[in-house]
């Protein structure tokens, strides 16, 4: 089966000032919950859009 | 080499819970997850759920929320799946099966045949 | 969930023939990494499940070259060129692209 949480990434080229780490998938670190029917494309593109937000609010020199 | 050695045969009533056992060896526990399979001859295989024994982090079938709860203990290499409120529903054979990225060699458990009967 | 249908349900064969699994998905298996993750896997009688085939068509180590893997998008086929009478048992494609993972009905292959 393939990994959900230890999966290999392809990294998101960003500015070298930020670091992003966030998975891609169904992730929950308690053992009580999880799951959801989200595609991967899906989630993969709500990722990008988050990080592109987060991009945005960085205050860039004059 | 590799091995993932489930725990035997279980016969349980109606309504109460079982916990499963899956022991890897032959590799380091925590750089692998661990996923579980349910096998019946009416629904054939499916996906329960995933654990990564790192961290504790879990995933789970939609399905089997409520019903399955994965752990792992990292001292022994040995995860762990509590099935409750068993009804005959849950009479299955269920297999552990070594996480990968998609490619990398795939390992199952010989398989743990689970009866719920009064 | 993705639907994962695979034909034909039993397939009986004479040893030395060939043979020919489909398997359709309800949505394209093509990931946003640009892989597709359909595997297969054999089933032997009173056996775990050993997966033969991942990526669509590369063969796991060991698997005999008579059986290749193709298709892409939606549509999968497993094919063995010379069926020999080792490869009885039921034959199951996968998909873990889309959570959460699924898997088709299942094939049985008997030998004529």
């Known amino acids: 089966m393939r990994n959900i949480f230890k999966r290999n990434q392809e990294p998101i080229v960003a500015p070298a000032t930020t670091t992003a780490t966030m998975p891609i998938g169904p992730v929950d670190n308690s053992t009580e919950s999880g799951g959801a029917g989200e595609s991967q494309e899906d989630m993969f593109a709500k990722l990008k859009e988050k990080l592109f937000n987060e991009i945005n609010k960085i205050p860039l020199p004059p | 080499q590799v091995q993932l050695q489930q725990s035997g045969a279980e016969l349980v009533r109606p309504g109460a819970s079982v916990k499963l056992s899956c022991k890897a060896s032959?590799?380091?526990?925590?750089?692998?997850?661990m996923h579980w399979v349910k096998q019946t001859p009416v629904h054939g295989l499916e996906w329960i759920g995933a654990?990564?024994?790192?961290?504790?982090?879990?995933a789970y079938n939609q399905k089997f929320k409520g019903k399955a709860t994965l752990t792992a203990d990292k001292s022994s290499s040995t995860a762990y799946m509590e099935l409750r409120s068993l009804t005959s529903e849950d009479s299955a054979v269920y297999y552990c099966?070594?996480?990968?990225?998609?490619?990398?060699?795939?390992?199952w458990g010989q398989g743990t045949s689970l009866t719920v009967s009064s | 969930d993705i639907v994962m249908t695979q034909s034909p349900l039993t397939l009986s064969v004479t040893i030395g023939q060939p043979a020919s699994i489909s398997c359709k998905s309800s949505?394209?298996?093509?990931?946003?990494?640009?892989?597709?993750?359909l595997n297969w896997l054999l089933q032997r009688p009173g056996q775990s499940p050993k997966r033969l085939i991942y990526?669509?068509?590369k063969l796991d180590s060991g698997v005999p070259d008579r059986f290749t893997g193709s298709g892409s998008g939606t549509d999968f086929t497993l094919k063995i060129s010379r069926v020999e009478a080792e490869d009885l048992g039921v034959y199951y494609c996968?998909?873990?692209?889309?959570?959460?993972?699924?898997f088709g009905g299942g094939t049985k292959l008997e030998i004529k």
């Open positions: 099966t070594r996480g990968n990225d998609g490619y990398n060699e795939d390992y």
């Open positions: 032959g590799y380091t526990f925590t750089d692998y997850e």
């Open positions: 654990i990564d024994p790192e961290t504790g982090g879990t």
């Open positions: 949505q394209s298996l093509l990931d946003s990494d640009g892989k597709t993750y």
């Open positions: 990526l669509v068509s």
């Open positions: 996968w998909q873990d692209t889309h959570f959460p993972y699924t």
